[in-house]
């Protein structure tokens, strides 16, 4: 199988000059490193910081949304070390960790006004911040937290370079004081969990301090990553010595503590994944160990399996796993070793980004009970990493996509099997981002974000789809690269889409490309299952072409067919007339066959033999409609592009088009009737349909009242016409 390659879909969208200047001002000092990350929230933000300067940009356009230069209490300006998106009381902002010569400061920054609205001092050097909750009080929405935490209003976990873990009260119930980062509040650290939290909090707040609970006192080992996993209600804490701890936010106790397989290498990132319908209540946590830019060269992914006693759905609709029974490492992937053949000796490998993407099936497709906790039917983790190779100016950048449900399907191996590489693995897909590096060099890539909504597998080439269709290498998605100078958009296409694009580009020379095109379609899983066990050499070129045309129609890749037709008509190559005749005949035969299949499927709708349609039959009918619709478009292309054709040929062509158009409309009407419950036609339908399907007076009254309301609200300015 060939390598998948990302395509750049935009030029560099540069940050405004003012942003570049502000960030560049501090790059001259040694400690000031330019950091940049996409914010994980839904607001489309990217945050960049260098020294005391913070720049917040639109992650799609690169335009400046907010900026701030932090001040300190002495001549040495503070350094922005940690930034996390945070929303509270209908406001969007950031939690920011500043390092000063003496300790740190936690700031609540309001993006709407580009100001710090709250600040509190912290001990030591903050290494990460993670919001736990953005409100407080003993409401239903805080019942998953320890009773002591429920008295606080907004909680952020803060960790330091000496291993301290603090849960800080953000005091969001008191936004009266007009603070900034210089005039930050004091902090009172509680080591145990006292009974009188409300009383203590009140007294502490009266003294102008914030309360905080210390989960772990300083150990001397830096915390390298921090993540709150809402679905398991755990705070995942990764340490610089390769240990990972899980703290339960209900009991405020440590549930798990272990050193990962790669030993004393910092745990650089964690991300959560949930499989589809695991009966044992298992979910997963990826822990990434990475040396990043420091000595050594380690980048390894560790998949931890967390098994819980209970999985429930809260009133809010949120899923919650409870009662951790065990946690163990189930899969390891070393991205620095020879997992995929690299030319040359690597000198440094570092993680650029990792994220998890979940998609839930739309409610209409669900079979579960209403109160059952739903699991995602798509669950993938995306890792992007950079490999620097000795003697090569440009680094290599890769994007890997792990599909946990396909890993289950592959019987949960603990690592790549011998002889198996990332680019031919059934649960892991690999894209090369070489084109991005070429276009953006010498600008360094800071982060890469895959757009969740763009992730799709495309249209199945047949029903049931072939096995390859489910592999992660069939995913298509868009992503954005955050650089030190702007943003760049890219698209990653799976084997199927890539194969169809290849065929589309092959154009008039299709005849020479049929064998190769057929093989590509076969490998990509685009052909009907009946071709899987057939030797390509035993098929004629016509049969192979028919298979390719079927793949194009099934996957709605109509540009492929209409492109061929237009080119053959205009370019008049030696084989053009033969090709056109062949495709027209094939299209019409396909219409006839699909109509026969459609009629066969619809018999039970009309003969009174069934009272409801099973989902499979409905899906098959819809598939027939889609095919008829696609074939109609192809015939329409023939009809509109036809030239130098006899009168009889033109009539024949237009008849074919009209007939296919009518069949298409008929199929549409049948589908509408079955969706509306008017089909299938039962024996006792006359009883059911004694009244109108639509209650006219009710609808009339509703719309009349709505019109009156609009008129009232607009004070006569609303024109109903």
């Amino acid at each position: 199988m060939r390598d998948l390659r990302a395509q750049v879909t935009s030029g560099l969208l540069p940050f405004p000059e003012v942003t570049l200047q502000a960030l560049g001002e501090d790059e001259i000092t040694l400690e000031s490193v330019l950091r940049g990350k996409f914010a994980a929230g839904k607001n489309g933000l990217a945050c960049l910081a260098c020294g005391p300067q913070l720049e917040v940009v639109n992650s799609i356009t690169g335009e400046r949304l907010s900026a701030y230069r932090f001040s300190g209490v002495n001549e040495q300006p503070p350094v922005v070390l940690a930034v996390k998106e945070f929303s509270w009381q209908k406001r969007t902002g950031l939690l920011i960790g500043l390092e000063e010569t003496e300790g740190s400061v936690l700031c609540l920054y309001d993006l709407g006004i580009s100001k710090v609205v709250k600040a509190v001092v912290l001990p030591g050097r903050v290494t990460a911040i993670e919001p736990i909750i953005n409100h407080g009080g003993a409401s239903a929405s805080t019942q998953h937290l320890h009773p002591s935490l429920r008295w606080l209003f907004g909680v952020a976990a803060v960790v330091t370079d000496v291993g301290q873990i603090l849960l800080v009260d953000l005091c969001l119930d008191d936004l009266s004081c007009n603070q900034n980062e210089v005039e930050a509040s004091d902090l009172e650290v509680l080591t145990g969990i006292p009974a009188e939290v409300p009383h203590i909090r009140e007294s502490v707040m009266r003294q102008g301090r914030h309360l905080c609970f210390q989960l772990v006192s300083p150990t001397g080992t830096a915390v390298s990553t921090l993540s709150y996993i809402s679905r398991t209600n755990q705070l995942a804490v990764g340490f610089s010595d390769g240990y990972l701890a899980l703290w339960n936010m209900k009991s405020m106790k440590r549930e798990y503590y272990i050193q990962l397989e790669s030993g004393q290498v910092p745990v650089y990132a964690v991300t959560f994944q949930e499989p589809e319908n695991d009966p044992r209540n298992c979910c997963y946590l990826w822990a990434v160990q990475s040396t990043q830019d420091s000595e050594g060269d380690v980048l390894s992914l560790h998949l931890l399996q967390l098994a819980f006693g209970n999985r429930k759905c809260l009133a809010s609709g949120q899923i919650l796993y409870e009662g951790l029974e065990y946690c163990e490492e189930r899969y390891t992937l070393d991205l620095t070793g020879g997992m995929f053949p690299l030319r040359g000796q690597t000198s440094n490998t570092k993680l650029l980004g990792c994220q998890s993407i979940e998609k839930f099936r739309s409610h209409g497709d669900r079979e579960e009970g209403v109160n059952e906790a739903l699991s995602p039917d798509t669950s993938v983790s995306v890792f992007t990493w950079q490999v620097n190779i000795y003697g090569q100016g440009k680094p290599s950048v890769y994007l890997g996509l792990f599909d946990i449900n396909r890993w289950y399907h592959a019987q949960m191996p603990d690592s790549l099997r011998s002889g198996e590489y990332l680019h031919n693995c059934s649960y892991f897909a690999l894209w090369s981002l070489e084109s991005v590096v070429s276009r953006t060099s010498p600008h360094g890539i800071l982060d890469i974000l895959v757009h969740e909504r763009s992730l799709n597998r495309g249209v199945p080439p047949s029903y049931p789809p072939p096995e390859q269709f489910f592999n992660p290498s069939t995913y298509n998605f868009d992503a954005t690269c955050l650089l030190n100078s702007g943003v760049v958009h890219l698209t990653c296409t799976g084997f199927q889409k890539e194969t169809l694009t290849f065929l589309k580009k092959s154009g008039p020379s299709l005849n020479e490309l049929i064998p190769d095109g057929y093989n590509r379609c076969l490998v990509a899983g685009l052909l009907s299952p009946r071709f899987v066990d057939v030797q390509p050499s035993s098929l004629s070129q016509e049969e192979q072409l028919e298979a390719i045309l079927s793949a194009a129609i099934q996957t709605s890749s109509l540009g492929l067919l209409t492109g061929y037709i237009r080119r053959w008509i205009t370019e008049e190559q030696p084989n053009s007339a033969t090709n056109l005749r062949f495709v027209l005949e094939w299209t019409w035969n396909k219409v006839v066959l699909t109509k026969e299949e459609f009629d066969r499927l619809c018999v039970p709708l009309f003969d009174g033999s069934c009272h409801f349609m099973d989902p499979q039959t409905i899906q098959s009918i819809q598939q027939c409609y889609l095919l008829l619709s696609n074939l109609n478009i192809v015939l329409s292309c023939f009809a509109s592009e036809a030239r130098e054709i006899t009168e009889r040929g033109l009539i024949d062509l237009s008849n074919k088009f009209v007939v296919s158009h009518l069949i298409c409309q008929y199929a549409q009407v049948v589908l509408w009737f079955s969706h509306s419950g008017l089909l299938p036609e039962g024996i006792d339908d006359s009883v059911q349909l004694s009244r109108l399907c639509y209650n006219y007076p009710v609808i009339q009254n509703y719309y009349t009242s709505r019109r009156q309301k609009f008129e009232r609200l607009s004070r006569g300015k609303w024109n109903p016409d």
Partner: nanobody
């Protein structure tokens, strides 16, 4: 940048009084409070008192409650600590401080900014 300068320390007999001053700059005390902390010989830092940003409120450690009073003069950008009925255990280096992290016993774990300190010695 924030600057804090303490003065007013000295040698005093038990039961005597002293008034410490802290001249501050680079700060808006309507937004934040200033604390007095101290370091007894051979011991760590401990919190003494704090004047809150609203000016009228103050907080004190149990060990000095009723004996020490904190106040401020906005026009002079100065905070005062009036210490009465001084005891031997009040002997310490006193600092005016901003941005404290402390535990529930009043032990100061870290200080964001403080002056050079002024020595108070209670001795007979």
């Amino acid at each position: 940048q924030v600057q804090l300068v303490e003065s007013g320390g000295g040698l005093v007999q038990p039961g005597g009084s002293l008034r410490l001053s802290c001249a501050y700059s680079g700060l808006d005390l309507s937004r934040v409070g200033l604390s007095w902390i101290r370091q007894p010989p051979g011991r760590g830092l401990e919190w003494v008192s704090k004047i809150l940003n609203n000016g009228s409120n103050a907080a004190y450690a149990d060990s000095v409650k009723g004996r020490f009073t904190v106040s401020r003069d906005n026009a002079k950008n100065t905070v005062y600590l009036q210490m009465n009925d001084l005891q031997f255990e009040d002997t310490a280096l006193y600092y005016c401080a901003l941005g404290l992290v402390q535990d529930s016993q009043g032990v100061v774990l870290s200080v964001r900014a403080r002056g050079q300190g002024t020595q108070v010695t209670v001795s007979s």
